[in-house]
Interface confidence: low
């Protein structure tokens, strides 16, 4: 069998909301993957599991099942959303993310994704991880790949 290539493209959008009373930030982060099937037979994308880390803490997880199949020598672009919560010991970020004196409230997040594909009863897992910058101060739609190159204020470690 030839390879199945998984390419993490980047953050597509990030939608933010706040809980004033709990000093909590909710970020719904939609990511884009390109999955290429270099084989002459179809493969099934069985599931995608993803997690997001902030300052070495997991702040969100997601799992998509029975996603799609990819035809021979074909490529599919798949979007998946990870709901994340920045709270509790990280509530200091609430002030940073809601400060109107700052134009862009970028934070650095570690995106981890594992794609499980199957073909002819054989299962294969491909994992990727990437640091991405996300604006936690407003709803943002990114051009694909754009969120890799933003300036960012590093969070407290």
């Amino acid at each position: 069998p030839r390879s199945i290539d998984v390419k993490y493209i980047g953050v597509k959008s990030a939608y933010v909301s706040y809980d004033v009373q709990k000093r909590t930030i909710y970020l719904n982060i939609t990511n884009t993957l390109n999955i290429t099937n270099n084989n002459y037979y179809s493969v099934e994308v069985e599931n995608i599991t993803a997690q997001v880390q902030f300052a070495k803490t997991v702040i969100g997880k997601a799992r998509l099942n029975n996603i799609t199949h990819i035809g021979p020598l074909d490529m599919k672009q798949i979007d998946y959303t990870v709901p994340t919560v920045i709270a509790e010991e990280m509530s200091y970020m609430y002030d940073f993310c809601t400060l109107i004196s700052i134009k862009v409230h970028n934070i650095v997040l570690m995106m981890q994704v594992t794609v499980t594909t199957t073909y002819f009863g054989h299962s294969e897992q491909i994992s990727q991880e990437r640091y991405q910058y996300v604006d936690c101060g407003r709803n943002t739609t990114y051009q694909l790949g754009q969120s890799e190159y933003l300036n960012v204020l590093q969070p407290q470690q």
């Epitope: 909301s17 706040y18 809980d19 004033v20 009373q21 709990k22 400060l99 109107i100």
Partner: antibody
Framework: QVQLQQPGAELVKPGASVKLSCKAS????????MHWVKQRPGQGLEWIGN????????HYNQEFKDKATLTVDRSSNTAYMQLSSLTSEDSAVYYC???????????WGQGTAVTVSS | DIVMTQAAPSVPVTPGESVSISCRSS???????????LYWFLQRPGQSPQLLIY???NLASGVPDRFSGSGSGTVFTLRISRVETEDVGIYYC?????????FGSGTKLEIK
Amino acid sequence: QVQLQQPGAELVKPGASVKLSCKASGYTFTTFWMHWVKQRPGQGLEWIGNIDPSDSETHYNQEFKDKATLTVDRSSNTAYMQLSSLTSEDSAVYYCARSSNWDNFDYWGQGTAVTVSS
Amino acid sequence: DIVMTQAAPSVPVTPGESVSISCRSSQSLLHVNGHTYLYWFLQRPGQSPQLLIYRMSNLASGVPDRFSGSGSGTVFTLRISRVETEDVGIYYCMQHLQYPFTFGSGTKLEIK
């Protein structure tokens, strides 16, 4: 549609306690805070406190800290407020009202009139 | 605690005219996120309060656009254009920037 159902009236004796209920329907109970507000006859509104039904986190107005206890029963989608050591000063209409994170008090109960009398 | 002051206990108005109801807070209700946490409610006689305006200037769902809210960090105005008889009742402002949430004493709208 969203509804917050409260009993119309409660008659209680001085020194006793009363537990007021507020039954929520028409929305996901655990995703909205529940607030309690007091209104004495012919007077204005006073915020007593609130509770997050998802984890029972509470905040109280200090003036009511020793008077009111807020709880929820997630199995019946009901919020409760217990008032203790009642005096004539506690005779009032008590409202429950829900709030999301941003848009507070968009739905109110009809209120329970508590009368403290021997 | 933040003190909310509604200086006018009542305001008389003729149906069809406009009226403004004012409210003042003892400290700014402008949050660092840009929102101003000032709410307006109407309590009609014998009824529960009804939300009119949230975050100082946003019209609540189902409220006629005759109602509008404006203000700065500490001084706020509820304006009702083309007053109708059904608008009678007591208007309360409320802050929920910080605990405990506090209400103004209310302003009664009376029809002349």
